[in-house]
Structures are given as C-alpha cells and as structure tokens.
C-alpha cells in the first residue's frame, strides 16, 4: 500500500527532513558544504548531488562564502543580504569561517603519515585526521589549505583529480571530495594460490555518505569554542577520540578482553565480543590477551594490513574471501564484487555497470561455488567479516541510487575499502 506523503520523511545525520525539503549537508571537517544540494525524495531517501556551476563570463569572478558558484562582480547580491558567518578562536588564534588550519596534539593515535586538519565553520572548529599521500620528492613543500606537504609542481594538492569533484568551501577554501586512492599492484588471481600484495591500509569504516568525504579522514572531533578540549571519551583516565576502540580496564578484573568499547563522539559504547561456536580445529586454545580461543599450529597467512586468527578469524569473527573483477569495453565498465560464504556454500556477486560515470545497471546474483570456480578474471582482494559486508551492502544501496542520477567516479572503489579489515593494534581487537 502507498505510504502517505505526510508520514514519509528522511533521516540525515540524525535530523528529520520533510519530503521535498532541500538543504546543504554539514560535512566534517568542512562544515556546511554549499556545493552540495540534498533533497528528501518521496520514498524517504536522501539524494545529494554536486552543484554544477555555470561558466562565468568575466575576468575576475568573486567567491561569496555562503554561495557555491563564483559570480561576476556586477551580479552580486546587495551588501545588506550578506550572511555574516561566525569566526572561531582556537589556541589563541582567530580563524575566519571556512578557513582551514593545522592543529597539533589532538589525536593520540595519529600515524606518522597523518596530520590533523581543522576548519572553522559557523563558529565551531572541526578537526579530522588526514592520511597524506606518499611523497615522491626529497623536498616537499607546505601549502596553505592542507596539513599535508606536497611535492612542488603537484598542483595545489597531490591527490588524484576527479573532474567536477571539488567542494568549494566558503572563503575560497577548497577540499576534494574523494578519498586518497592508494596505488597498488593488482593482487594475484584466485587460481594462483598465494596471497601476496593487497591494497594498503583501509581507514574507512561504515557507509560512505555522511562524513567520510575527505581524503583519508578517519575520525572527526568537534572543538567547541567555549570548551577548548575536544569531544572525546575518557575511560579509566585515558582519552579516546571519536571512533577509537579499546578494551575496558576494570579495577577488579584488569583488562576485559571480551568487551570492546568504542568512542562515539563523547559517549562510550561497549559491547561483548561473541566468539565462534564452531572452530576449524578440534582443540582451540585460550591465549592471554585474546578474548576468543584460537586454533594452535601454523599462523594463517597474513594479508598486509590485516590480522587473522588461524583459519581466517578476525577479532573472533569469521572471515570470508572477497573477489573482484573489473571489465571494460566500449566505454562501459562492469565491476563485480563477490563474497564467498560457507553457510550456505555459495558466492554472492554484486554487479555494477557504469558508463561515463553514471550507473547503468546494478544487480545481485547468487551462484554456487562450483559455478564461481568456472569464472575467470576474479581476483582475491581481501577477506572480510559479515558485519563489514553488511556495512558495504548498506552503503552500496545508497550509492546505487545516487550514482544512477549523477556522475560517480570513485564512490564504488571507495566503498570497497570498507571490506578491508584493520590490523588489530598490539594484538587487541
């Protein structure tokens, strides 16, 4: 039966929107992104698309903070219409709305190839860890709008270009709407047996749409003007950033390996780790520092950037192989992503057909393992867990809608990164 429009609404970043309502999304660490329009569609789905700017016919177009597209000076709105955006104060320095800057010492888990990128938006400071691209020169230089250093001559930022994918920030600041895509040798084909080189560290979890638009941004924290400390979780005297996980340390019990806590903005959420009911060996053993028993014997082959128990368990959760096949012909790209499951013993294949960046066709098929073995071109790319696969399929549902009405260049590649499992730090999950 038809859902009455009055009952239908869209949820986006914990806010309700009525059908037909339009807005600019708020994407950390950038704030309001004026170059993206979102609309709540009749079926309750949010459709966001980039604003396509018309060509301007003047020598010196002007950028207005709250407008996406540059304007010719003679077509500017009157001064009294001007939106005054709040500035931010951080560490004794005042930043204008839309300004990007670098901060130190905010994230305890910062990797050597990461830097802290902050921006001022509507009076609030947003910061995120940004993973910087590998530098190929001896003397990199700093650039005004990124905390990452770049090689001279690499343009403003040495990220891959993706035409029309620039989010123009207020106050003429720019940030690219694409992950940094690591380059890697294609892994060996399924038949080859060996699991050699795999795509590098995947630092993106969850569905792609809301706040993970920046290159390599793995966490975001909001720094309120009044309270200079970040929005973090404090547990047992230790500070954790949004998105960080840890095992709680209880005075009476010590570190509880079978409970995993995650920092969600300022709230810690803890859940019990569920160990598998069945193990692929007769006598699994309990090991100090691990929640679940593991099978003794030779270590399972580790995929770089991933850490599995024997027979493919990751942090107590069973892992399954993921295969990929990319086929290009006549300007059309068919991408197939396949998950092999044991129960039932079959392969679920997700097929994407893309022409000129527009999704032509998307469907899911299930075939037997025997049938899958007949198929060429599939390469084993990683192993993943059912929970990561669920996140992947949810994100896929979103982008299959989004990319059928607008150009998508790297969204699917970026989403596939969700399937890569993080190497567990210091043996903890």
């Amino acid at each position: 039966e038809q859902v009455k429009h009055s009952e239908t609404y869209c949820m986006f970043q914990d806010k309700k929107y009525r059908v037909g309502e339009r807005w600019h999304p708020y994407l950390e660490p950038y704030g309001l992104v004026y170059c993206v329009n979102c609309i709540c569609s009749e079926n309750g789905n949010v459709l966001c698309s980039r604003v396509r700017c018309p060509n301007v016919h003047c020598l010196s177009p002007v950028h207005i903070p709250h407008l996406c597209c540059p304007r010719c000076p003679d077509s500017l709105p009157p001064v009294n219409n001007k939106v005054t955006s709040k500035s931010c104060e951080y560490n004794g320095t005042t930043y204008q709305h839309g300004e990007l800057f670098v901060a130190e010492g905010l994230f305890q888990n910062r990797q050597p190839n990461q830097c802290t990128q902050c921006s001022c938006s509507e009076g609030n400071v947003y910061c995120g860890l940004k993973t910087c691209p590998k530098l190929t020169c001896a003397f990199p230089v700093s650039v005004p709008d990124s905390c990452c250093r770049v090689c001279r001559g690499d343009g403003e930022l040495s990220w891959e270009h993706s035409d029309g994918d620039i989010f123009r920030q207020p106050a003429n600041r720019e940030a690219r709407h694409s992950y940094h895509r690591s380059h890697y040798d294609p892994p060996p084909s399924r038949q080859a047996g060996g699991l050699s080189r795999f795509p590098g560290a995947r630092s993106h979890r969850g569905a792609l749409m809301d706040s993970q638009q920046a290159s390599g941004t793995i966490v975001q924290i909001v720094i309120n003007n009044k309270h200079k400390h970040g929005q973090v979780c404090v547990s047992n005297g230790k500070t954790y950033s949004h998105g960080e996980s840890w095992h709680p340390n209880l005075r009476a019990f010590g570190i509880v390996e079978c409970v995993l806590c995650t920092c969600n903005v300022t709230k810690q959420e803890c859940k019990k780790i569920h160990c598998p009911n069945r193990y692929p060996c007769k006598y699994p053993q309990k090991i100090d520092g691990k929640c679940c028993k593991v099978c003794p014997g030779k270590k399972a082959k580790e995929l770089p950037g991933q850490s599995f128990d024997n027979k493919g368990y990751f942090c107590g959760e069973e892992t399954m192989p993921v295969y990929e096949s990319v086929f290009m012909e006549d300007g059309e790209t068919t991408r197939k992503i396949a998950l092999e499951t044991e129960r039932p013993p079959q392969v679920e294949v997700h097929v994407w057909t893309i022409r000129k960046g527009i999704l032509q066709h998307f469907h899911i098929e299930k075939i037997s393992k025997r049938m899958f073995e007949e198929l060429p071109h599939f390469k084993l790319v990683t192993r993943t867990t059912l929970s990561q696969w669920k996140i992947f399929t949810e994100g896929e549902a979103q982008i299959s809608q989004m990319c059928s009405s607008r150009v998508c260049r790297t969204e699917l590649e970026d989403l596939v990164k969700v399937l890569y499992l993080e190497r567990s730090e210091k043996g903890h999950c």
């Epitope: 012909e329 068919t334 396949a338 098929e365 299930k366 037997s368 049938m371 060429p376």
Partner: antibody, heavy 120, light 107 residues
Framework: QVQLQQRGTELVKPGASVKLSCKAS????????MHWVKQRPGQGLERIGN????????NYNEKFKSKATLTVDKSSSTAYMQLSSLTSEDSAVYYC??????????????WGQGTTLTVS | DIQMTQSPASLAASVGETVTITCRAS??????LAWYQQKQGKSPQLLIY???SLEDGVPSRFSGSGSGTQYSMKINSMQPEDTATYFC?????????FGAGTKLELK
C-alpha cells in the same frame, strides 16, 4: 548486429570425428563466453561446455569431457567444437550460444541457428 | 545435479488468454533462472533471465516470477506468434540444467 553462423548439416560415419564451427560477428568476440548446447528430439537441451575466447580457457559438463573439445580462432572470430568417437547417440542439433556479459550466471542471449549432426 | 521439473508438458490457449508455465528446482537456485522460447525449426531465444528480468526486445506480455525452488513464467495475453516450446534453465550451479519443455499451442 550480433550473429553466430553455423553450418546447417553434417553427416558422418560412426567412430569418426567432426569439427563444428561457429563464426561470430557484430561484437567483440574475445569479450563473451561461447557455449555449446546439444538438443536431441525428446531429450531436451544440455550444455556441453564453454570457452573463454580471450585465453582459450574451457569448462566442460562432466558428461561430455571425453566427447567434446572446444577451441577458438581469434583471428577469424570462430569457435569450434570437435566431437570424437561418434555414435548414433551423438546425432542431434548442436548450438553455439553467447552468454550475457554483465551477469555471472550463464544466460544465453544469442544463439547460432544450429548444426544438425547425423551419425549414420 | 539440480533437476528442473517443468509443467505442464503441453497446453493450448486461445488468443488473449493468460498462460502460466511453472518450473520447480530440486534445490534453492536463488533466482538464477532463465526462460527460453523455441519456435519450430529455430534456435531458442532468451525471454527472461535472473527469474524476472525481461530481455531487450521481448514483448512486455511476458513476465517471470518466483523464488527459492518455485518459478513461473506468465504470458499475459496469448498471441498466435507465441506458439512455441518454452524451456526453463537453472544457472545457479554447474552443470546447467534445463526443464523438459512446455509445448504451447493455439486453441
């Protein structure tokens, strides 16, 4: 337009071998699986096997493994099936068929007109 | 091997009548099913794939449905040119297997 051309009839003696051909046109030959299907009156349809024209990789139905050999000639965009040690059981219509590319399951979207093989 | 049981083996329908042909798989084939039409002396033609997707150029009076082990194909308004034998085929597992066929004649 896509076409798969097969010779109409072949008449061979028992114990001999025969090589059936299927010439493809109207599409990139190396980009699609080519399958062979047997149809005997009152016996329905059976897939014999398939070949990947880009690298010559083959898959056979267990039942036809010792009977059929699939090959391709990329230069002429032609697929071949050789049937050996023929008996009257091999008398049938043999079709070549191309399978849809953006599906992993084998769905045959174009068929040749078939070659009627008579072993007698 | 997966067995495909097709029914009825034959039927006759008048122009404009709705015709339904069913196919039962011996195990779950997860929508990996195709329907083919074969006219007398001709090669088969793909009508429906993935259980319910209509092949390009096939009239919209043909439709497919079903899930698990039970599938059916419907012709919404029988036309004289629909006189043919119809086969179902499972594409979930190898070897691929076909139904025995349903011969549809004009009444």
């Amino acid at each position: 337009q896509v076409q798969l051309q097969q010779r109409g009839t072949e008449l061979v003696k028992p114990g001999a071998s025969v090589k059936l051909s299927c010439k493809a046109s109207g599409y990139t030959f190396t980009s699609y699986w080519m399958h062979w299907v047997k149809q005997r009156p009152g016996q329905g349809l059976e897939r014999i096997g398939n070949i990947n024209p880009s690298n010559g990789g083959t898959n056979y139905n267990e039942k036809f493994k010792s009977k059929a050999t699939l090959t391709v000639d990329k230069s002429s965009s032609t697929a071949y099936m050789q049937l050996s040690s023929l008996t009257s059981e091999d008398s049938a219509v043999y079709y070549c068929a191309r399978s849809k590319n953006n599906y992993v399951a084998y769905y045959f979207d174009y068929w040749g007109q078939g070659t009627t093989l008579t072993v007698s | 091997d997966i067995q495909m049981t097709q029914s009825p083996a034959s039927l006759a329908a008048s122009v404009g009548e709705t015709v339904t042909i069913t196919c039962r798989a011996s195990e779950n084939i997860y929508y990996s099913l195709a329907w083919y039409q074969q006219k007398q002396g001709k090669s088969p033609q793909l009508l429906i794939y993935n259980a319910n997707s209509l092949e390009d150029g096939v009239p919209s009076r043909f439709s497919g449905s079903g899930s698990g082990t039970q599938y059916s194909m419907k012709i919404n308004s029988m036309q004289p040119e629909d006189t043919a034998t119809y086969f179902c085929k499972q594409a979930y597992d190898v070897p691929l297997t076909f139904g025995a066929g349903t011969k549809l004649e004009l009444k």
